[in-house]
Amino acid sequence: LTCLGGFASPGPVPPSTALRELIEELVNITQNQKAPLCNGSMVWSINLTAGMYCAALESLINVSGCSAIEKTQRMLSGFCPHKVSAGQFSSLHVRDTKIEVAQFVKDLLLHLKKLFREGQFN
């Protein structure tokens, strides 16, 4: 994922409890990862800016048959105001860059932790 710095509000901003649950789920995924996550599937990288939750879902929804991220997909759909289906792409995708799901999750986790801290202290 790109644009880790200088991000705008990720709109819509989920309540801190829901954000905390999403972060906990991503932590579980990264900690419990033994074999390559989702068999090393590749997804489009995204810009971590406004609309990030929908963009993340649009990327991850194209990964099928990976039970490890199903809960994450469901949680992200709760943060995205519109229906997302496989093959859908927004301008937030960095269309020339694909990364492994494991790296996508790690980058998203790092960014969401920053958002959580921001929300806590501001």
Partner: antibody
Framework: EVQLVQSGAEVKKPGATVKISCKVS????????MHWVQQAPGKGLEWMGG????????ASNQKFKGRVTITADKSTDTAYMELSSLRSEDTAVYYC?????FGGGPFAYWGQGTLVTVSS | DIQMTQSPSSLSASVGDRVTITCKAS??????LSWFQQKPGKAPKSLIY???RLVDGVPSRFSGSGSGTDFTLTISSLQPEDFATYYC?????????FGGGTKVEIK
């Protein structure tokens, strides 16, 4: 190895202000929130406040009625806690503490403590 | 503010004993609870976070349990180095609050 090194002991007069520093190493300073905890002699632990070093946003305990100012200097990886209008009951050891909220908890690592004595 | 009521405030035990310390929150804290050990003149040391997760390097005789408002720290077989004061902390919401502490003394 994560390390938090605090400034040395201080003796202050009532009404004065004390500023304690906490220099960190072993992790990226902006990755974890930083908190300050007070422990009066023979007493328990009390959370004073904390800061997100990335943004400078703070939260503090109303018990200290605006006397606490917490800051962070990203250029030196150092956090500061300033306590003003000191009174005798502020005599205590002050700790800085940090950690990953989601991976060890926000108080996983502690400084060695700084004794502040308030006496006329 | 969330109140954390820790009990007992002190206890006497022997090496090898099973020791249980409890912490009760005034409202649901979503298991955002840590346990600390403190020895005289030293900074607290983190033992447990998220109610039941053991901090790296902490002996497995320490364990945490509970959810909602009621939490427990258990030392399965007390060792000489475990005589200390123990504190719980809720970090579910600001202001973060500690329990009053439990001093574990030698019987």
């Amino acid at each position: 190895e994560v390390q938090l090194v605090q400034s040395g002991a201080e003796v202050k007069k009532p009404g004065a202000t004390v500023k304690i520093s906490c220099k960190v190493s072993g992790y990226t300073f902006t990755d974890y929130e930083m908190h300050w905890v007070q422990q009066a002699p023979g007493k328990g632990l009390e959370w004073m406040g904390g800061i997100d070093p990335e943004t400078g946003g703070t939260a503090s305990n109303q018990k200290f009625k605006g006397r606490v100012t917490i800051t962070a200097d990203k250029s030196t990886d150092t956090a500061y806690m300033e306590l003003s209008s000191l009174r005798s009951e502020d005599t205590a050891v002050y700790y800085c503490t940090t950690g990953d909220y989601f991976g060890g908890g926000p108080f996983a690592y502690w400084g060695q403590g700084t004794l502040v004595t308030v006496s006329s | 503010d969330i109140q954390m009521t820790q009990s007992p405030s002190s206890l006497s035990a022997s090496v090898g004993d099973r020791v249980t310390i409890t912490c009760k929150a005034s409202q649901d804290i979503n298991s955002y609870l840590s346990w600390f050990q403190q020895k005289p003149g030293k900074a607290p040391k983190s033992l447990i976070y998220r109610a039941n997760r053991l901090v790296d390097g902490v002996p497995s005789r320490f364990s945490g349990s509970g959810s909602g408002t009621d939490f427990t720290l258990t030392i399965s077989s007390l060792q000489p180095e475990d005589f200390a004061t123990y504190y719980c902390l809720q970090y579910d919401e600001f202001p973060y609050t500690f329990g009053g502490g439990t001093k574990v003394e030698i019987k």
